[in-house]
Each structure stands twice: as structure tokens, then as C-alpha cells.
């Protein structure tokens, strides 16, 4: 059983990935980012079903993509750079999903925009989040 | 129809500099990236970098960050890359390249015929 | 930055052969969410700009002959040409443009026997 510590890092990481991609979004946002529409054309996939931490799979098989549609912007638009701040999130994401179960994402048929993926996944966290508190 | 049309070949002095354009027609080259790659015989193909012509905004890698500028002017439709402390390694042909699409997944599908840059003293 | 390893160097052929050309990438290429392959093979003749053949690994560019196939997943992919004519000469070079910086394979001379 998950104990009150354990619990509570968990929440401090998420709260820490919630953050990260809040910070993304804003970014991408922002109203001097010249490179939205252009953004807006990538392609991003979400998981059918997104309810508990093993789902963040889903989340970290796109990370590499979202790396590259961050090199696109400016990056004055984020305090890191779009590498930096991918690893970030990838650690988190892995201490959070745990690497001893192998979990087998499954993709929903339709795609989204960043600004769609961005706030699914920030939609996960804050969920989680509640759950915990 | 989509073409890139590169200007003539260029013969260089060691540590002199050469300025080379891109000139895009059938498509506003605002709409897509333009990428520079290096064409040596022994070496291959290596990518320079692209440029946002709709910005202005570069990214180059590592190896060529102090040796190219890349730079666009929308009016002409046309991409620049300036080449500077030129040494006999730079002797190559330097290509540019569109996507196949605009949505960054795509690999270069149109090129220009290439420009040819000597350095020889 | 992903490296490509391309083998053969050279490879000399007769008419009418069939060739295999391997290209193995340091990383996968495969993104999960559409299955796809962001590796990509060019024929470059001398003298000649690349010619976009295969993209996403396996699917044809428009007006290439059916005779050019790619397959493979993850980090190892072939370029096979059955068939081969005398026009097939050239250079044949993968790329990968999954991960920045993009970066080619060092290329395959396909040269006559």
C-alpha cells in the first residue's frame, strides 16, 4: 500500500510535471509567438484512456515529437532550452509511470494539436492531483 | 510547378567569404522552412541548417554555427547562406530544400540543382 | 545526435540484379502514435541534386519506379532494388529526420559490374 511519503512525492512530482507543461503552453500562447500557426500543423496522439499513472506511457512516447515542434519556436518564449526542458520532463514522467510494468499505450483514431495535447495531459495531472489530495 | 533555382559556381580564395541564393517558385516561401546541406564527395551528405523565412528565425548545426548565415528576404522569394573564413574543406556543393509538407514530419522532397563553391589559393 | 550507419560503401552489380542497401540509426525512429518510420532514402546521380525515393521508411514518393522497396522498423531499414537497370547507378543515401539534427547515412555507391 502506497504510504502517506509516497503519496506525497507523487503529488510533488506531478505538481512539478503540471507546472512544466503549463509552462509550454504558455509559451506556445503567448501572443509574440510568431510560430503558432505553424505549430498548429503538427500532428500529436493521444491515449484512449488517460486515468491513471501507468497511462503516462502515452505521454512520454511523444515527448520526442514535442521536442521537435519546440525547436521551432523562438526560444526566448521558454527560461530552457526545448532539450532541456524535455529531459526534465521525461524524468519525471518515468519516476512517476515506474519502469517495472511494461504498459502498451493505446492511441485514440484522431489527432491533436499541441495546444490539445498540451492541455489533455495537463487535465491528467491536475485530476491525479485531487485524487491524491 | 515547385522549383528552387541556386545561383552560379563560385570560385574563392582561402578566408574569403561567398554569398549564396535560393530562389523558390510555385509556392510562397514564407509557407516552409528552407534547409542548406553540403554535398562533399569523400564526406557525404551533411545537414547546414534551415531558416524560417517568414521570421528570419535560424537553426544550424553545431559544426557549421560559426561557418553559416543563413538569411531569407520574403520580397524575392529567394534564401541566402553567407559562407565566411572559407578554407579548402568548404569546397563542396551546397544545396537548399523544402519539406514534402509543412507539418515538420516530412523529409526534403525539393531541391535545388546545387551550387558549387571552390576555395583554392 | 542520431548517427546513421549505411553498408555497403560500394556495391557492383550486374543488370537485372537484385541489391539490398542497410542503414542502421543509433536510435529507434518509430513513433508509437502513428507507426511510423521517420527514416527517408535519396538516389543522388553525379552531378545531380538528391531525389526523394522512400519516405516514412516504406512509402513510395510519387513517380518512383515500384522496383525501389523500403522496409524495416526501429533502427534497422533496407533499401532493396530488384531489378536493377543501368539508370540505378548513383549514390544512395538514408536519412533520418525524426530527432534533430537531421543526419544521413554516408552513403552507398551502386556502381556496374
Known amino acids: 500500500a502506497p504510504t502517506s511519503s509516497s503519496t506525497k512525492k507523487t503529488q510533488l512530482q506531478l505538481e512539478h510535471l503540471l507546472l512544466d507543461l503549463q509552462m509550454i503552453l504558455n509559451g506556445i500562447n503567448n501572443y509574440k509567438n510568431p510560430k503558432l500557426t505553424r505549430m498548429l500543423t503538427f500532428k500529436f496522439y493521444m491515449p484512449k484512456k488517460a486515468t491513471e499513472l501507468k497511462h503516462l506511457q502515452c505521454l512520454e512516447e511523444e515527448l520526442k515529437p514535442l521536442e521537435e515542434v519546440l525547436n521551432l519556436a523562438q526560444s526566448k518564449n521558454f527560461h530552457l532550452r526545448p532539450r532541456d526542458l524535455i529531459s526534465n520532463i521525461n524524468v519525471i514522467v518515468l519516476e512517476l509511470k515506474g519502469s517495472e510494468t511494461t504498459f502498451m499505450c493505446e492511441y485514440a483514431d484522431e489527432t491533436a494539436t499541441i495546444v490539445e495535447f498540451l492541455n489533455r495531459w495537463i487535465t491528467f495531472c491536475q485530476s491525479i492531483i485531487s485524487t491524491l489530495t | 510547378e515547385i522549383q528552387l533555382q541556386q545561383s552560379g559556381p563560385e570560385l574563392r580564395r582561402p578566408g574569403s567569404s561567398v554569398k549564396l541564393s535560393c530562389k523558390a517558385s510555385g509556392y510562397n516561401i514564407t509557407d516552409y522552412l528552407i534547409h542548406w546541406v553540403r554535398h562533399r564527395p569523400e564526406h557525404g551528405l551533411e545537414w547546414i541548417g534551415w531558416?524560417?523565412?517568414?521570421?528570419?528565425?535560424?537553426r544550424y548545426a553545431q559544426k557549421f554555427q560559426s561557418k553559416a548565415t543563413l538569411t531569407a528576404d520574403t520580397s524575392s522569394n529567394a534564401a541566402y547562406m553567407q559562407l565566411s573564413s572559407l578554407t579548402p574543406e568548404d569546397t563542396a556543393t551546397y544545396f537548399c530544400?523544402?519539406?514534402?509538407?509543412?507539418?515538420?514530419?516530412?523529409?526534403?522532397?525539393?531541391w535545388g540543382q546545387g551550387t558549387l563553391v571552390t576555395v583554392s589559393s | 545526435d542520431i548517427v546513421m550507419t549505411q553498408s555497403p560503401f560500394s556495391l557492383a552489380v550486374s543488370e537485372g540484379e537484385m541489391v539490398t542497401i542497410n542503414c542502421k540509426s543509433s536510435?529507434?525512429?518509430?513513433?508509437?502514435?502513428?507507426?511510423?518510420?521517420?527514416l527517408a532514402w535519396y538516389q543522388q546521380k553525379p552531378g545531380q541534386s538528391p531525389k526523394l525515393l522512400i519516405y516514412?521508411?516504406?512509402t513510395g514518393q510519387s513517380g518512383v519506379p515500384d522496383r525501389f522497396i523500403g522496409s524495416g522498423s526501429g533502427t534497422d531499414f533496407t533499401l532493396t532494388i530488384s531489378d536493377v537497370q543501368a539508370e540505378d547507378l548513383a549514390d544512395y543515401y538514408c536519412?533520418?529526420?525524426?530527432?534533430?539534427?537531421?543526419?544521413f547515412g554516408a552513403g552507398t555507391k551502386l556502381e556496374l559490374k
Open positions: 530544400a523544402r519539406s514534402l509538407d509543412s507539418t515538420y514530419d516530412y523529409p526534403f522532397a525539393y
Open positions: 531558416i524560417d523565412p517568414e521570421d528570419g528565425e535560424t
Open positions: 516514412y521508411a516504406s
Open positions: 536519412l533520418q529526420h525524426y530527432i534533430s539534427p537531421p543526419t
Open positions: 536510435q529507434s525512429l518509430l513513433r508509437s502514435g502513428n507507426q511510423k518510420n521517420y
